[in-house]
């Protein structure tokens, strides 16, 4: 999607959130996948009638991606080459490198809650010793 | 260059009608959500909309909620304020500035329009 | 809504001086803090996002950090630009709020 955007940090860390802050985020948790393959990222929003402004999908201190309620997804430049959109809400990491091991955060953009931040943490391993839940594994 | 350009200020007496407007440029403006921020003289900032990039999203101050009305054209890169019964309290410097992609702050701001409410 | 409370409303300075200002969130902001400057006449500028991101094209003298409720604005050495008004912001919920603004004199 064509984005004019001067730079891409971006904040992380746990939501503060609206006074009547009900919801929860669900995440994958931990996670890993072998070198070369690909994972899904997925949180899930619930118990709250917040509407859903935007998502933003980030590793540590770098912005990875939004999806934004009105202009649909964007996928920061530099990583486009290896994040695709979806499935829903969620990123889809594709030729995993052990580089990608780390803390992804899902920020949810709401209102009036405010925000929403949901953890993730990927490993990402040299040999076929990676489990995790076919669900959330791309063959 | 990213340029945003208020306009439509003035003065008008209590209970009237003005209609600001922002000109963008240097921007794909329909990518973006934008804002209404106003600084009353000599005094700080006031956040007073919200609009998101395609219009679904809208929120007020409770200050200007049913008086004020914000909207957008995309295919002019313009932004509005419509503003109703106007208040001596809403005489200020009003802004228009540019929602970061990301949605953490307010990155480009025009330089302002005045508008002074009294009789 | 979020109080905003910044610290001090106003500041001497000499050019070269180290210069810290606070802003205190009412509640849990997260990192969700913005700072702006904001010349006599003009427009506010964006300096720092996310608590301590700084925008594009700032420069590096200015640093934010903090998280919760208690933010700090650092500007290492005070340049003669410097000299202006400060104001923190939350970027967390709505209606975004801003602090009253600290004002950088010369001395």
């Known amino acids: 999607y064509p984005y004019d955007v001067p730079d891409y940090a971006g904040g992380g860390g746990s939501g503060g959130g609206g006074s009547m802050m009900t919801g929860t985020i669900e995440t994958t948790g931990n996670i890993s996948a072998e070198k070369g393959g690909s994972i899904i990222l997925q949180c899930h929003l619930s118990s709250t009638t917040a509407q859903v402004t935007q998502v933003n999908w980030e590793q540590q201190d770098q912005l990875l991606a939004i999806c934004n309620a009105d202009a649909g997804w964007h996928i920061s430049p530099s990583f486009k080459d290896r994040v695709a959109p979806g499935p829903g809400l969620g990123l889809t990491l594709q030729s995993l490198t052990v580089n990608d091991t780390g803390e992804y955060f899902c920020i949810y953009h709401t209102y009036p809650d405010g925000t929403y931040t949901g953890r993730i943490f990927l490993e990402v391993l040299e040999s076929s010793v990676a489990e995790h839940g076919a669900r959330f594994q791309i063959p | 260059e990213v340029q945003l350009v208020e306009s439509g200020g003035g003065l008008v007496q209590p209970g009237g009608s003005l209609r600001l407007s922002c000109a963008a440029s240097g921007f794909t403006f329909s990518n973006f959500g934008m804002h209404w921020v106003r600084q009353a003289p000599g005094k700080g900032l006031e956040w007073v909309a919200f609009i998101s990039s395609g219009s679904s999203s809208i929120y007020y101050a409770d200050t200007v909620k049913g008086r004020f009305t914000i909207s957008r054209d995309n295919a002019k890169n313009s932004l509005y304020l419509q503003m109703n019964s106007l208040r001596a309290e809403d005489t200020a410097v009003y802004y228009c500035?540019?929602?970061?992609?990301?949605?953490?702050?307010?990155?480009?701001w025009g330089q302002g329009t005045m508008v002074t409410v009294s009789s | 809504d979020i109080q905003m409370t910044q610290s001090p409303s106003s500041l001497s300075a000499s050019v070269g001086d180290r210069v810290t200002i606070t802003c205190r969130a009412s509640?849990?902001?997260?990192?969700?803090l913005a700072w702006y400057q904001q010349k006599p006449g003009k427009a506010p500028k964006l300096l720092i996002y996310?608590?301590?991101t700084l925008q594009s094209g700032v420069p590096s003298r200015f640093s934010g950090s903090g998280s919760g409720t208690d933010f700090t604005l650092t500007i290492s050495s005070l340049q003669p630009e410097d000299f202006a008004t400060y104001y923190c912001q939350q970027h967390n919920e709505y209606p975004w709020t801003f602090g009253g603004g600290t004002k950088v004199e010369i001395k």
């Open positions: 509640k849990s902001i997260s990192k969700y």
């Open positions: 500035a540019r929602m970061r992609l990301d949605y953490y702050a307010m990155d480009y």
């Open positions: 996310s608590g301590s």
